[in-house]
């Protein structure tokens, strides 16, 4: 399911429960996706020892995965709500091609991988409603994404395992950073 349990309109409208605010819905959605990533990481970590490797050992890769930096306005120092929100949405849009790549990478967690992908699309929609400056958000080029996807899928098995691990770890870190920032807004 792309939305966490208790998030559909029937549940939200239930008389015993207060409807979630926009911020609460976003917060819950991110936590739901993080739980999904955690399940996917369990499968990848059981298959290889990459999860124990230090970041430096895995740093040499040609993936251009979105990453939070000081200039993005999402950290405690130099925090800027609008700049940060643009970075979060832009980053999530950039991650979409990598989430597509993950779709055929799991045996026992195929549905979980799909749920993470669909939930991220829903999260992007929630955040776009929150953002005032939608013009500042750049959408990735579909042609570039298609060729990147083809290139990633053509890698040998070891590189594909490494890519899967790096995507999950980077996406987890990006979402955790986003959550910390959104909780300050």
């Amino acid at each position: 399911a792309p939305v966490p349990p208790g998030e559909d309109s029937k549940d939200v409208a239930a008389p015993h429960r207060q409807p979630l605010t926009s911020s609460e819905r976003i917060d819950k959605q991110i936590r739901y996706i993080l739980d999904g990533i955690s399940a996917l990481r369990k499968e990848t970590c059981n298959k290889s020892n990459m999860c124990e490797s230090s970041k430096e050992a895995l740093a040499e890769n040609n993936l251009n995965l979105p990453k939070m930096a000081e200039k993005d306005g999402c950290f405690q120092s130099g925090f800027n709500e609008e700049t940060c929100l643009v970075k979060i949405i832009t980053g999530l849009l950039e991650f979409e091609v990598y989430l597509e790549y993950l779709q055929n990478r799991f045996e026992s967690s195929e549905e979980q991988a799909r749920a993470v992908q669909m939930s991220t699309k829903v999260l992007i929609q929630f955040l776009q409603k929150k953002a005032k400056n939608l013009d500042a958000i750049t959408t990735p080029d579909p042609t570039t994404n298609a060729s990147l996807l083809t290139k990633l899928q053509a890698q040998n098995q070891w590189l594909q395992d490494m890519t899967t691990h790096l995507i999950l770890r980077s996406f987890k870190e990006f979402l955790q950073s986003s959550l910390r920032a959104l909780r300050q807004m």
């Epitope: 993080l34 124990e52 990453k67 950290f75 405690q76 979402l175 910390r180 909780r183 300050q184």
Partner: antibody, heavy 120, light 110 residues
């Protein structure tokens, strides 16, 4: 053995500086969030600051502008640079590890602590 | 800024007693609360995280409950090894806060 060991504590004058170290063994520090927590003599625990996987940091209000957390991944060591020290900074300083697998901060591995005394 | 208020600050109890310690957050922190035990001269030890999940190796006489702003740590049958100071800690947000920990509860022998 998986452990954290703090060092660098000692006596320092008010207004002075000190750098504490937290050496990790048995695991790669770069894979974890690491926090500093202090405890003044006879008092409770006080959270000081944290460094996340992306070198993002956050600090308690009392530490902002005076304390800086950094790490040297090649040495598998975390640092707490403390400037403009005051008498109220006197405490045992602990570093602690958060497994960073979830979104909430919780500290499941602690060092033994190092004592910092600020006095003239 | 989130503030954590723990009560009582100290309590006296006997071996075998049921002990309850409460912790209140100044705003909702979901279930993002941990409990620690600390003995004199030692580092704190994680007991419970996510409000109710027992940390590895922690005896089942310890339990945690609560969500939102109100949380409880319960020791079902106090043992000699349990006389210590207990702290709650919010893990919801570590930005713009004075302290992530509650003030502590010292459990003493009656």
């Amino acid at each position: 053995e998986v452990q954290l060991v703090e060092s660098g504590g000692g006596l320092v004058q008010p207004g002075g500086s000190l750098r504490l170290s937290c050496a990790a063994s048995g695991f790669s520090l770069s894979n974890y969030y690491v926090t500093w927590v202090r405890q003044a003599p006879g008092k409770g625990l006080e959270w000081v600051g944290i460094i996340y996987g992306s070198d993002e940091t956050a600090y308690a209000t009392s530490a902002i502008g005076r304390f800086t957390i950094s790490r040297d991944n090649s040495k598998n060591t975390l640092y707490l640079q403390m400037n403009s020290l005051r008498a109220e900074d006197t405490a045992v300083y602990y570093c602690a590890r958060d497994d960073s697998s979830d979104w909430d901060a919780k500290f499941n591995l602690w060092g033994q602590g190092t004592l910092v005394t600020v006095s003239s | 800024a989130i503030q954590m208020t723990q009560s009582p600050s100290s309590l006296s109890a006997s071996v075998g007693d049921r002990v309850t310690i409460t912790c209140q957050a100044s705003q909702s922190i979901n279930n993002e609360l941990s409990w620690y035990q600390q003995k004199p001269g030692k580092a704190p030890k994680l007991l419970i995280y996510r409000a109710s999940t027992l940390a590895s190796g922690v005896p089942s006489r310890f339990s945690g409950s609560g969500s939102g702003t109100d949380f409880t740590l319960t020791i079902s049958s106090l043992q000699p090894d349990d006389f210590a100071t207990y702290y709650c800690q919010q893990g919801y947000s570590l930005r713009n806060i004075d302290n992530a920990f509650g003030g502590g509860t010292k459990v003493e022998i009656k």
